[in-house]
Structure formats: structure tokens, C-alpha cells
């Protein structure tokens, strides 16, 4: 059984007192609809709540908003609605919150059908007040903000016109017709494609990509016979249609479109798809989808150029038709990746990855659990974690995984013990070791979230009975207190606390239901009087990530090299703070073998850790392309794995060969493109 | 198997200060903290500090803060103690530990290897 | 810093007796405790780590238990080489010391 309250669990002392004069409730005067929730800036405490409610009449739909505020994370809400003149917002393009802490919030407005453009109500000062702009046209798509320039929006309207503002909506300014997909990239660069024919849709394949870099006034083609194109990390990829065929193939380039490389990934057909899972200016993990109505694929990781790809997964599962993959990057723990592969059975299992996609492993049992009935032996079987997948199939998980970059080690996530991923009523596991080793946490599904960079965990349980009751641990989840919030309980609809997991507000959102009325309630609940004092260097103690086996010299070595951070004892009941900031230390270990991935023409034979030369690309969809022409290649067949930081040791020396291969690429290349100036 | 060995026994004058060094063999010295710890004469045990080879980060009881200095040389994997401005009451057997480990957290399973323990005495 | 207390002091017991000895932890330190064995002259010897797990090489007639404040070690059956000074040792805080109980023959 998961743990809980009883005398072995260092209680909080007079916490109930504690939590009830932080506990704050507000009561929303207003139609029960939908809501929802933003926070505007970073530490600001600002949050934005929008309520909705739609009749649905004969003719047209009459809809009501209402807009909130808060700046005390929640507390007090006030009614701001006659900021946006009472307007009706629309809901599908949420609200546009600026990047970092700008400040900017854009609402996009519902206008009458006749209407020459739409609407949208603009705030630079973090939605205190906003500014009503009519727009020269029908945006399709929610305001883009330039990562680097917040003033730079970029929109689609629904005629497939591409329209930027450059100052904060200002002004708006078509730069181009016919765009199907835009993109900022770095730089304030927008990458998009445009059709020539008919429309998106019937020119899938022949698109082209184009890009420019200021704002609309040059522009460049950069790729043809385009059926679409992503951004991951610093490359830029772009799948493109084969001259003889219906396949597709990969192109990536790592200089915005200026030169492009033939990705050494296997081709896909018309019903098969490409997707970039995880990707940093490191390397990429690319997802090819398998021939048929499958619901798997392959996952490959990149090399540093995005060009050369080692098979990493097989049977991952990723379904074509809701477009469902539980791939989970694991932000607290470097190198860890999580996911679901479909067996021959069809059952799913997780997969786990320490290592950025080199080996993957089933999770470790959790120690305080039995195998359940998917087991075919009962001292045997792993962890299966439920994700994006699970919930699609309305199974009965509320949240995906979680994990926090600044709550190092801890990842929480919904799961079953056994030989996969079992339909019953799942459990709450936590790991505080980055997914190497699991506990179960919660008894049944619950929705949790984390504060105070991990110093506190709050958890409520999934029901579909009104609640009043919050579960909160100061020990990574050992033990639980429980705290009634409310003496009536509420119809629980989420959980909401500040992204990025410092902050020690929570807020509970629900709505309660008499005879005649519906309302919308929060209940914000203030954590900082449980954690009293600041934390000190004594609170902390030494962890060794990666650490498997302490008798092995280069124990803890990932990516060639391995990190000890300081992380906060479990007993320690104490505040880390909004400025925390997570102490590690790195050291580099020594280059072996695994420190390195195969080169072009070059594989590793199972259980071999040495790279050995392709026989002459007999039965293998090996193309090599690079700049758009054929290449000569030097390579020793071995590359350093990309983020890689070992220095010394092994040291892989081999006679350089010069691999000359046939570049079947169609794609443009640098020479041929052209450019045009509006 | 891991062995410990300390330097030999030493009396010193109060005010000055003493070295012990502890030398490990036969293990993975950089991957395991080595705590110190002493025993005055009829006394119980008393932990003052220890460090973590890899990247040297040490740290210390409350009690010995200031006057201990625990470092390592991985080169050839032996940890030194030294305290400073000694008095009488430091006259004590002081042993070096390894910290046992099993996952990555350094000090939390308990000392399974110790020094054969130093003589330190204190006197005028 | 967190301080350990340990019972009884000192305990008389005959060969083949029951021993049990406590150990109190002023907050809850889950299970990160560990007990050891010294005999005079010689350096201490780990018994049991992690609360109730017992070292390799440690005869199995030695138990651990307990988690949060309240910990035990057990001697299912006292031996004549049994007969020594135990100290618990927190190891959630800076680590701390029991003040030891002597197990003395009757």
C-alpha cells in the first residue's frame, strides 16, 4: 500500500490552523460555461480568467463572456469585463500571452457575420488595461509573438493571407497570399508555405517554403515540393516529395534554408507520417511512422547534423489516427526519456531511456507494489506509465507525467504494475530518482502538481462526488497530510499553480451546483506558513545522478559526463523560494565506445559496440545528400554522440574513408533558389 | 576488498593544528564520501564532516565548522583531515569512513568501511 | 541539527536472551538510520543500514526496524561475541550519533 498518515510520517505541525488563513475563496457571479485560466508574466502574480457561456440558438449562437483578474496568485479576482466593452471572446483561440515577462495578453473577439475583419483587444501592462483594435481581416489562427520581439505578431487569416504587425497589433500588413503553415523561427525569421494551385490541402506535396527575415519585405524560396515543413531545436526540417514517386523524404538544414542535407531516414508513403518527438540545438528525436494502419513506428535519434540517424525504438507507439504518442521528455533528470511501445500482443509497454535514446529499458518495479493481473509471473514485471494515450482512450487518468527542470529527480505520474499497461483503475507512482526507481505514491488517480521546486507536492483525488479535501506531502510524497478546504464541497474541474513549479500558491477550481444556480468557485491556498523558514545549507545533501553502481569508476556517467547536485532532504520542512536556483556540479568522465554513434555507411552489429562498415549498401536505404549535391564524405564511422562531453579514453582511430554516395535528392538546391522583394 | 588505512598517532600542543590522512585501496575511491568521525576516551562517537572526492565538495558538523578542513586527493585516493587551533578536549581516536551507497545519495546508508582509527592527543 | 537518543544505556542480558534496543530521532528522518557495533579498541562495524536492511556478512539474528522517529535493533538470540557497545546514526540531517548502549554480560 502507498504510504500515508500514521506515526512513522514526520507530520506538519499545526498545519490545519496554518492553511486555513491562507486558504482564500472567490466566487464567480456568472453563468457556469467553460473557463479558462492564464498567467501573465513570470513571478507576477497576474492571472486571467476567462468564462464562457454559449446557447446554441436556431440562427446564431448567443455567447457571454466575463474576464477576471488577480494579481496575488488567485487570492482576489476582480471583474474586468468592461475593459473589453463586455465583448463575447473567442474561446478556440484562447488567450495570447506574450512571451517572458512582457506583459502583453491578446483577445481575440467574436463579431457579427457581416463584419469586414475581426476583432481583438490588446494589454501591454500585464492586462490592467486594454486597447480595442478592429482587424483588416478574419484571423484563422491565434497572434503569434516572435520569440525574440514581442511587438512582432504574426497571424493567418481565414482567406490564407499571412499578416504581421510590428507593433503589438497595432497595424497590420499582409505579406503574402496563399499560405498554408507559418513559423517564427530565430532571429524574428517566419518560415511558411504557399500553395500555387488550388489550396492547402490539394497542393499538399507541392507546396513551397518560403522565408523571410525581415518582416516581409524580401523574401526567399527555400524548399519545393514541399508536403510540410518543423522547427526543432536549430534545425529546420522539411519533408519533400520524390520525382518518381508518392514517397516523401526528410531534408534538414541547420543554416534557416540557405543549404539543406537528405536526412538518412527511411522514405514514408502517403499514409505514413514523420514526427519531430523531442528536439534541442543538440539533436532531434525523429518518429517514422510504419507502413499500414499499424498505430507504431520507428524513433531515431540524430547525429549533430541532424543528417545521420541511429534506430533507437522499435513498435513505438504513436497512432495515426488520433495522433496519440506518450512520448514524455523528463525534464528533472538529464538524458530521460519515457514512452509506450506496442508488443506483438498489442498490449502496451513503457520504455524508459537514461542515455537520450541509446537503450531503453522497461521501468523497475516499484518496491511497495504487487504485479497485477497482466503479469505472467508475479515476482516479475515493470512499472507501465499512462500518458497522452491513455487518456485518449478515456481511461481513468486525469494527468499526464510531471516533472519539473528545477525539481531535480522527481517524476509523478499515473501507472499499473504488471507485464503492461492494465485498463483497471490506476495508481500514483513517484520516482525521485529520475524514473531509475518507483514508489507508489497515491492509492487511485489523482490530479498533483508540484511547488516550491519540489519542497511541496499537493495532490486531489479524481472523483466524480463533489470534493473539499487536498492531499499535500513536504517529502517528495512518503508521507501525506490531508486538509479540508472547504466545509462545502465542490465539483472539482482542476488544479492550478504557476508554471515552472516555484511558486507555494495552489489553486483549486470547481463549481458548485444548487437547485436553480451553477457557479464558478476557486479556492486558492497560500503553502508558505507549512514551509516556515527559508532553507539552509544544512537542508541539502549530495546526490549523484545516473548513479547505478558506486564499484563502477565511470558510475553516474551520462553523455560523458556526470552531475552531483544538492538536493533537499526529505525531513527538511523548509521554503527553497521563487530564486532558487538548482546547485550542480559537473565532471567529465572518459570517452568509450557508447560515448559514440555510428557514422554514415557504418552500423553496430547486435550486442557490439564497434562500428563496422555497411556491406555495399546491399538492401539498405542508404542515400547520402548533402548541400543538394552529391558529396564526397570522409568519416573514421564513428561521430560523437550530439551533447556529449567526454574527454580522454577510448579514442576510436580507424583509416578515414572517402564514402562516395548516390545523392537521389530532387530538392533545390542552393544555386537554383530564388528570391523576391515586396 | 576496500581498505582504509590511517596515518600513524600524533600529540600535538594546544593551539596548533594536526593532519590525518586515510588512504583507501582496493575500490572505487571517487564514487563514495569519506566521513571522519571521533571518539574521545570512554565517549561516544562524533561525527565531524566528510567529503565527496568527485568535485570535492565537503561538508561539516555545526560543532566543527570553521576549525575542520576535510579535502581529497583523488590522484591517490586518500582523504585528509586537519583541524585547527587544538585544545584539550579534541584529544580523541579519530577514524575515516567510506559511506556505503546504493543509489545515488552519498551519505544516507551508513559508514561499511572504516580506518583503523588515529590517536590524536592534546597536551601541553 | 537533529539529535538522536538512545535506550537504554546500559543493558545487562545473558547469552541467548531477546535484546532489544531504541533509538529516538528528534524529527522524522524516514529510514535513513543505521546501526553499529563497537567493541573496545576497535573501530565501529555497520549492522544495519537504511532502517531494517541488514549489511552483508552481518549474522541474520540481528534485526532493524522502524521509520519517521522510533527505531529498534533487535538480537533475536544474544552470542557470547554479541557483547559490545551499539550506536544508532541518523544519516537524513547532518549525521548524528546515539549516545550507544552498552550490552554488558548479567
Known amino acids: 500500500s502507498a504510504p500515508g498518515e500514521d506515526e512513522e510520517c514526520g507530520r506538519v505541525r499545526d498545519f490545519v490552523a496554518k492553511l486555513a488563513n491562507n486558504t482564500h475563496q472567490h466566487v464567480f457571479d456568472d453563468l457556469r460555461g467553460s473557463v479558462s485560466l492564464s498567467w501573465v508574466g513570470d513571478s507576477t502574480g497576474v492571472i486571467l480568467v476567462l468564462t464562457t457561456f454559449h446557447v446554441p440558438l436556431v440562427i446564431m449562437t448567443f455567447g457571454q463572456s466575463k474576464l477576471y483578474r488577480s494579481e496575488d496568485y488567485g487570492k482576489n479576482f476582480k471583474d474586468i469585463t468592461d475593459l473589453i466593452n463586455n465583448t463575447f471572446i473567442r474561446t478556440e483561440f484562447g488567450m495570447a500571452i506574450g512571451p517572458e515577462n512582457s506583459g502583453k495578453v491578446v483577445l481575440t473577439a467574436e463579431v457579427s457575420g457581416g463584419s469586414r475583419g475581426g476583432r481583438i483587444f490588446r494589454s501591454s501592462d500585464f492586462a490592467k488595461n486594454f486597447v480595442q483594435t478592429d482587424l483588416p481581416f478574419h484571423p484563422l489562427t491565434q497572434m503569434m509573438y516572435s520569440p525574440q520581439n514581442s511587438d512582432y505578431l504574426l497571424a493567418l487569416s481565414t482567406e490564407n493571407g499571412l499578416w504581421v504587425s510590428k507593433n503589438f497589433g497595432g497595424k497590420w500588413e499582409e505579406i503574402h497570399k496563399a499560405v498554408c503553415l507559418a513559423k517564427w523561427g530565430s532571429d524574428n525569421t517566419i518560415f511558411f508555405t504557399t500553395y500555387a494551385n488550388g489550396s492547402c490541402k490539394a497542393d499538399l506535396g507541392a507546396l513551397e517554403l518560403w522565408r523571410t527575415s525581415d518582416l516581409g519585405k524580401s523574401f526567399k524560396t527555400i524548399g519545393v515540393k514541399i508536403y510540410s515543413f518543423g522547427l526543432g531545436g536549430r534545425f529546420l526540417f522539411a519533408s519533400v516529395m520524390a520525382d518518381k514517386d508518392t514517397t516523401r523524404r526528410i531534408h534538414v538544414s541547420t543554416d534557416q534554408g540557405d543549404t539543406w542535407s537528405m536526412a538518412q531516414l527511411p522514405s514514408v508513403g502517403q499514409e505514413q507520417f514523420y514526427s519531430i518527438l523531442a528536439a534541442n540545438d543538440d539533436m532531434v528525436f525523429m518518429h517514422v511512422d510504419e507502413p499500414g494502419d499499424t498505430g507504431f513506428g520507428t524513433i531515431f535519434t540524430s547525429d549533430d547534423r541532424g543528417i545521420v540517424y541511429s534506430k533507437s525504438l522499435d513498435r513505438h507507439l504513436y497512432t495515426t489516427t488520433g495522433g496519440e504518442t506518450d512520448f514524455t521528455n523528463v525534464t528533472s533528470l538529464r538524458g530521460v526519456y519515457i514512452t509506450s511501445v506496442l508488443s506483438e500482443d498489442n498490449s502496451i509497454q513503457t520504455m524508459i531511456t537514461f542515455d537520450q535514446g541509446g537503450r531503453w529499458t522497461h521501468l523497475r518495479k516499484p518496491e511497495n507494489s504487487e504485479c497485477d493481473a497482466t503479469a505472467k509471473n508475479k515476482n516479475e514485471c515493470s512499472l507501465a506509465i499512462h500518458a497522452s494515450y491513455s487518456i485518449s482512450q478515456k481511461l481513468n487518468v486525469p494527468m499526464a507525467p510531471l516533472s519539473e527542470p528545477n525539481a531535480v529527480g522527481i517524476v509523478i505520474a499515473h501507472g499499473s504494475v504488471g507485464d503492461a499497461i492494465s485498463v483497471m483503475v490506476p495508481d500514483v507512482y513517484i520516482s525521485d530518482d529520475g524514473g531509475y526507481s518507483w514508489t507508489k505514491m497515491l492509492e487511485g488517480p489523482h490530479y498533483y502538481t508540484i511547488l516550491d521546486s519540489g519542497g511541496i507536492i499537493v495532490a486531489i483525488e479524481h472523483s466524480s462526488r463533489p470534493i473539499n479535501v487536498i492531499k499535500f506531502s513536504t517529502d517528495e510524497g512518503q508521507c501525506w497530510q490531508t486538509y479540508t478546504f472547504t466545509r462545502d464541497p465542490i465539483y472539482f474541474t482542476g488544479l492550478a499553480s504557476e508554471p515552472g513549479a516555484r511558486s507555494m500558491n495552489i489553486s483549486i477550481w470547481g463549481f458548485t451546483e444548487s437547485f436553480l444556480t451553477s457557479q464558478w468557485v476557486s479556492y486558492t491556498i497560500d503553502f508558505k506558513d507549512i514551509l516556515e523558514r527559508n532553507c539552509e545549507e544544512k537542508d541539502y545533501t549530495i546526490w549523484l545522478a545516473h548513479s547505478t553502481d558506486p564499484e563502477d569508476y565511470e558510475d553516474g556517467c551520462i553523455l560523458g559526463y556526470k552531475e552531483q547536485f544538492l538536493r533537499l532532504r526529505k525531513s527538511s520542512v523548509c521554503q527553497n523560494g521563487r530564486d532558487y536556483v538548482v546547485t550542480k556540479q559537473p565532471s567529465i568522465c572518459l570517452c568509450s565506445l557508447e560515448d559514440f554513434l555510428c557514422d554514415f555507411g557504418y552500423y553496430r552489429p547486435e550486442n557490439d559496440s564497434k562500428c563496422v562498415e555497411q556491406p555495399e549498401l546491399k538492401g539498405h536505404d542508404l542515400e547520402f545528400c548533402l548541400y543538394g549535391r552529391e558529396e564526397h564524405l570522409t568519416t573514421n564511422g564513428y561521430r560523437k554522440i550530439p551533447g556529449d562531453k567526454c574527454q580522454g579514453g577510448v579514442n576510436p582511430v580507424r583509416e578515414v574513408k572517402d564514402l562516395k554516395k548516390k545523392c537521389t535528392s530532387n530538392f533545390l538546391s542552393p544555386e537554383k533558389q530564388n528570391s523576391k522583394s515586396n | 576488498q576496500v581498505q582504509l588505512v590511517q596515518s600513524g598517532a600524533e600529540v600535538k600542543k594546544p593551539g596548533s593544528s594536526v593532519k590525518v590522512s586515510c588512504k583507501a585501496s582496493?575500490?572505487?575511491?571517487?564514487?563514495?564520501?569519506i566521513s571522519w568521525v571521533r571518539q574521545a576516551p570512554g565517549q561516544g562517537l562524533e561525527w565531524m564532516g566528510g567529503i565527496i572526492p568527485i568535485g570535492g565538495w565537503a561538508n561539516y558538523a555545526q560543532k566543527f565548522q570553521g576549525r575542520v578542513t576535510i579535502t581529497a586527493d583523488e590522484s591517490t585516493s586518500t582523504a585528509y583531515m586537519e583541524l585547527s587551533s587544538l585544545r584539550s578536549e579534541d584529544t580523541a581516536v579519530y577514524y575515516c569512513a567510506r559511506q556505503g551507497r546504493k543509489t545515488g545519495y552519498y551519505y544516507y546508508y551508513g559508514m561499511d568501511v572504516w580506518g583503523q582509527g588515529t590517536t590524536v592527543t592534546v597536551s601541553s | 541539527d537533529i539529535q538522536m537518543t538512545q535506550s537504554p544505556s546500559t543493558l545487562s542480558a545473558s547469552v541467548g536472551d531477546r535484546v532489544t534496543i531504541t533509538c529516538r530521532a528528534s524529527?522524522?528522518?524516514?529510514?535513513?538510520l543505521a546501526w553499529y557495533q563497537q567493541k573496545p579498541g576497535k573501530a565501529p562495524k555497520l549492522l544495519i543500514y537504511?532502517?531494517?536492511s541488514l549489511e552483508s556478512g552481518v549474522p541474520s539474528r540481528f534485526s532493524g526496524s522502524g521509520s519517521g522517529t522510533e527505531f529498534t535493533l533487535t538480537i533475536s538470540s544474544l552470542q557470547p561475541d554479541d557483547f559490545a557497545t551499539y550506536y544508532c546514526?541518523?544519516?537524513?540531517?547532518?549525521?548524528?550519533f546515539g549516545g550507544g548502549t552498552k550490552v554488558e554480560i548479567k
Open positions: 524529527q522524522s528522518i524516514s529510514s535513513w
Open positions: 537504511k532502517a531494517s
Open positions: 546514526q541518523q544519516a537524513d540531517g547532518h549525521i548524528t
Open positions: 582496493g575500490g572505487t575511491f571517487r564514487n563514495y564520501a
